[in-house]
Interface confidence: low
């Protein structure tokens, strides 16, 4: 039998063989072609299921096809989920979690925004009271309290009398910005720490003055008597 392949009956990319019985050419087609001579293009977009995954759009080409992928997918058949997190879009130590065609930033506490780029200003609600000065911190705030106040929000009026600063039986009165000592009779000073000098000016005419608490006594010189040795 003559070799039917001599006349090149098959498309150039096909493999030709000869039927040993009939002597006719057998064309084995490359992918994407059909027909007796493998010269007809297979429309991959029309036969059966869409070869493009994830709703990619199929475009027929000579001997093949192309997939035009939807947002978030890539690859010859749109089979690969694009990792939108590779560019590191999330800020402030947020975790980026890849989603179809987009990403989600899971923020660390204290941050917000699509990219966790916004430091939440916890001072916005004016949390510090009694004249405290608010300073914004990551996931919190701090209050610098004026004298006489304490607590995380300066909400506590410090009881300066708690340490019993007043001496000699004085009465301690708590004030917004400190305390006041109200001295018992015979004492003076901020803390009532000093005994009032009842010998000044010298009340004893002819004798030595002895200071007491809110009082004095006179030690008279020989020959003198009376409360003031007068």
């Amino acid at each position: 039998l003559d070799d039917a392949c001599v006349s090149n009956p098959c498309h150039e990319d096909a493999i030709c063989d000869t039927n040993p019985v009939s002597g006719r050419a057998i064309c084995t087609c490359p992918p994407g072609f059909t027909g007796g001579a493998c010269d007809q293009d297979v429309d991959e977009c029309s036969i059966g299921a869409n070869p493009c995954e994830h709703l990619g759009r199929c475009v027929n080409t000579q001997g093949s096809f192309l997939c035009q992928c939807g947002r978030g997918y890539t690859g010859p058949r749109c089979e690969t989920d694009v990792n939108e997190c590779l560019s590191g879009p999330c800020r402030n130590q947020a975790t980026c979690l890849d989603r179809i065609g987009q990403f989600t930033c899971i923020c660390m506490a204290g941050f917000t925004g699509t990219y966790c780029e916004v430091d939440i200003d916890e001072c916005q609600s004016s949390p510090c009271v009694n004249g405290g000065v608010c300073k914004d911190r990551v996931n919190g705030f701090s209050c610098t309290c004026p004298s006489g106040f304490s607590g995380s929000m300066c909400q506590l009026d410090v009881d300066e009398c708690a340490s019993t600063p007043c001496r000699n039986g004085a009465k301690c009165v708590d004030q917004p910005d400190g305390y006041e000592c109200r001295c018992a009779e015979g004492f003076e000073g901020t803390l009532c720490e000093r005994n009032v000098d009842d010998c000044s000016p010298d009340p004893c005419h002819h004798g030595r003055c002895v200071d007491g608490i809110a009082s004095f006594s006179c030690a008279c010189a020989p020959g003198y008597t009376g409360i003031r040795c007068e």
Epitope: T80, L97, C107
Partner: antibody, heavy 115, light 108 residues
């Protein structure tokens, strides 16, 4: 077919350890964040931990922090949960799930902590 | 932490009736990152809704999600026998990720 299959559950004494595994197939595992979620008998769902696709970031529920460790081997398409210092309250069905809103769940594996 | 409160705890309805499930957040859920799940006894949960209102693949159109900020709703327009189950909402806006305590939809 997208599939997650957990294994490694069982009975363990308080203070003991277990390592759960989750074999993934049918999707690009290395591009997906993965989570563990648990459900105590007769109770609701509780998020346990999450790991980013690259394994670079992990987060945990306060109830397991310092005791559980999530990890992954992208070359093996497998997610892990190492559970140490187990307590009775850790008794639950443990599910592995894809991403952070869970498009795919495993069938779950039961962990029982009891003396 | 964002606390999710679902109501009611139990909903007793007949097939064909409309079911309305509520999920309220203790603070605003950023970008409406809220999902709904259905769980039947002995089964893993199944994703129904993500992004507050987007139906997951293969979920029937009778399921719909709505809401934003702190108030979210799952509606089942006409209950089918297979819809009787427990439903959970979940936020994935901030760590820790949290779930609601669940709403059981039972046959009346």
């Amino acid at each position: 077919e997208v599939q997650l299959v957990e294994s490694g559950g069982g009975l363990v004494q308080p203070g003991g350890s277990l390592r759960l595994s989750c074999a993934a197939s049918g999707f690009t595992f290395s591009s997906s964040g993965m989570s563990w979620v648990r459900q105590a008998p007769g109770k609701g769902l509780e998020w346990v931990s999450v790991i980013a696709s690259s394994g670079s970031n992990t987060y945990y529920a306060d109830s397991v922090k310092g005791r559980f460790t999530i990890s992954r081997d992208n070359s093996k398409n497998t997610l892990y949960l190492q559970m140490n210092s187990l307590r009775a309250e850790d008794t639950a069905v443990y599910y592995c799930a894809r991403s952070i809103f869970y498009t795919t769940w495993g069938q779950g594996t039961l962990v029982t902590v009891s003396s | 932490d964002i606390v999710l409160t679902q109501s009611p705890a139990t909903l007793s309805l007949s097939p064909g009736e409309r079911a309305t499930l509520s999920c309220r957040a203790s603070q605003s859920v950023r970008s409406n990152y809220l999902a709904w799940y259905q769980q039947k006894p002995g089964q893993a949960p199944r994703l129904l809704i993500y992004g507050a209102s987007s139906r997951a693949t293969g979920v029937p159109a009778r399921f719909s999600g709505s809401g934003s900020g702190t108030d979210f709703t799952l509606t089942i327009s006409s209950l089918e026998p297979e819809d009787f189950a427990v439903y959970y909402c979940q936020q994935y806006s901030n760590f820790p990720i949290t779930f609601g305590q669940g709403t059981k939809v039972e046959i009346k």
